[in-house]
């Protein structure tokens, strides 16, 4: 970068090299060139010579002033016009950055995705800081009082093997950058309460010719959790509003869910599950599209994703559920 050049003097920024976006800043350049009394001192930002707001402070120093500086990053350098030199002489350069102090991290969430072997903690970092911001995740056992800290720049995966202090923990997040530091509220967790079942996946759909044609959606999960509650949402692709069916599910076999749908319409389906009575849901599964036939013939749709299932599938049973209307997004 610009900071690696050989300097014949120095360049500095007030109030600092990293500063709050929108501030007024001054960039100073001081020449120190053997037998060169600079006739002029020039400033360049990202290679372009600045023309205004330059003040000569003294024989070897000049100041460039910026009002309301809004660029997240800029490379600055300055040069001197030395007598009897046809080219400007490079004095020094510096990379400058502007941004914001971190917001207080909120919505701290820790979940264990089944089979992952990790506890994944995420949070809402707030507004973009534009500058390097680090997060320290504190995990404190409520049983042993032992505290562990994990440094990251976004979310964190903590191996469940490293959580040796029992089942109950406090988790909080500290955000820090050059402009400030903030700390989240503490989240109390129990490891047994934060497990999210293995992803539920829609594998296929078929519309069966009957007096009233019905569509059967086939879906499954690899979970070993016994009590699982699921939601399936669906809508015509032309609609805004989702319809939601709720199920209490036992994944010892492939699930079949029946829907009575309008003919000759393209529908989209998604499913998600949680351990019954627990807090966190899976994210909604991938979109599964199925177009109902105009008339009699049987239509089968296959999922876009092809998963390999470990269990041999022989018996299929029908599960039905309660139908609701849903405007919710994808928040667990």
């Amino acid at each position: 970068g610009i900071t690696n050049i050989n300097c014949s003097g120095h360049i500095w920024v007030e109030p600092a090299t990293i500063f709050k976006m929108g501030m007024n800043i001054s960039i100073y350049c001081q020449a120190a060139i053997k037998n060169c009394q600079p006739r002029k001192l020039h400033f360049y930002k990202n290679g372009i010579k600045e023309r205004f707001q330059i003040t000569r402070i003294n024989k070897t120093t000049a100041r460039l002033w910026y009002k309301n500086f809004l660029e997240p990053h800029a490379s600055m350098y300055c040069t001197a016009e030395c007598p009897k030199h046809f080219q400007e002489t490079l004095i020094c350069g510096k990379d400058i950055s502007s941004g914001y102090p971190p917001d207080i991290p909120d919505e701290v969430t820790c979940v264990i995705y089944e089979y992952s072997g990790n506890m994944t903690c995420t949070w809402n970092a707030g507004k973009l800081t534009y500058i390097d911001t680090k997060y320290v995740v504190h995990v404190k056992s409520l049983e042993t009082e032992e505290e562990q800290q994990y440094l990251t720049s976004s979310y964190i995966n903590i191996s469940t093997d490293s959580l040796q202090g029992g089942k109950k923990y406090l988790v909080w997040v500290q955000a820090a950058n050059a402009l400030g530091m903030e700390e989240s509220k503490q989240l109390q967790i129990h490891l047994d309460d934060i497990v999210i079942p293995s992803a539920a996946v829609i594998s296929r759909a078929e519309t069966i010719n009957a007096t009233v044609p019905k569509t059967i959606i086939y879906w499954d999960s690899q979970t070993t959790i016994e009590k699982v509650s699921c939601e399936m949402r669906y809508k015509a692709t032309t609609n805004q509003t989702w319809n939601v069916k709720e199920f209490d599910t036992n994944f010892t076999y492939v699930q079949q869910s029946e829907f009575y749908l309008e003919p000759n319409i393209k529908y989209v389906f998604q499913v998600r599950c949680q351990e019954t009575g627990k807090r966190y849901w899976q994210p909604w599964s991938s979109l599964f599209f199925h177009k109902t036939p105009e008339t009699v013939p049987q239509v089968t749709s296959k999922a876009f994703q092809h998963d390999t299932w470990n269990s041999g599938l022989t018996v299929a049973s029908i599960s039905t559920g309660h139908l609701t209307s849903d405007n919710r997004g994808d928040i667990g």
Partner: antibody, heavy 117, light 107 residues
């Protein structure tokens, strides 16, 4: 083009002080490094002191360290040389000169200072 | 301090002659050497800077050479207006110092 115009000739008694001015035009004082050089009658050139841009400081020759003061007034674009405790061997022509990449490209016209009782 | 020794201290020459003046520094001054011409009652005038660079406006009969400790000013063909005193000056380190001067006189 730099022009350096010095104040007029002075006659001083031994022990007195003299102040010679050097008015700059064409450039500002902040864009120039002003040095002072003197020449005793029939003798060579002697560097007295001046601004060193590499270290941003005013330097003085050892012989003059205790009694020479170099100042600048950017509001009037005037450099001054004050020499105290004058002796008869301080009789000389005093020049201000603008340093330009290791040489003096621009000189004042010179100021004759005569020290005599 | 760096001592600058010029030789000869004076030289008698005729118009059209080639004149060479040398200047020796008591220690290495790289190429930080200038040559001046001074006429009676006038301020010196720079001829050569950084040992060999000709100052703008100076006739090309003047040339400079050398580096380190030994330097030369050459006037290839002496003209009537060249009769004057010549000084070398080092600018490698402070205090800057001058040679004692070489007077070029009419033979």
């Amino acid at each position: 083009q730099v022009q350096l115009v010095q104040s007029g000739a002075e006659v001083k008694k031994p022990g007195a002080s003299v102040k010679v001015s050097c008015k700059v035009s064409g450039y500002t004082l902040n864009e120039l490094s002003i040095h002072w050089v003197r020449q005793a009658p029939g003798k060579g050139l002697e560097w007295m002191g001046g601004f060193d841009p590499e270290h941003s400081e005013t330097l003085y020759a050892q012989n003059f360290q205790d009694r020479l003061t170099l100042t600048e007034d950017t509001s009037t674009e005037t450099a001054c040389m004050e020499l105290n405790s004058l002796r008869s061997d301080d009789t000389a022509v005093y020049y201000c000169a603008a340093e330009s990449y290791g040489d003096y490209e621009f000189w004042g016209q010179g100021t004759l200072v005569t020290v005599s009782s | 301090d760096i001592q600058m020794t010029q030789s000869p201290s004076s030289v008698s020459a005729s118009v059209g002659d080639r004149v060479t003046i040398t200047c020796r520094a008591s220690q290495d001054i790289s190429s930080w050497l200038a040559w001046y011409q001074q006429k009676p009652g006038k301020a010196p005038k720079v001829l050569i800077y950084t040992a060999s660079s000709l100052q703008s406006g100076v006739p090309s009969r003047f040339s400079g050479s050398g580096s380190g400790t030994d330097f030369t000013l050459t006037i290839s063909s002496l003209q009537p207006e060249d009769f004057a005193t010549y000084y070398c000056q080092q600018a490698n380190s402070h205090p800057w110092t001058f040679g004692q001067g070489t007077k070029v006189e009419i033979k």
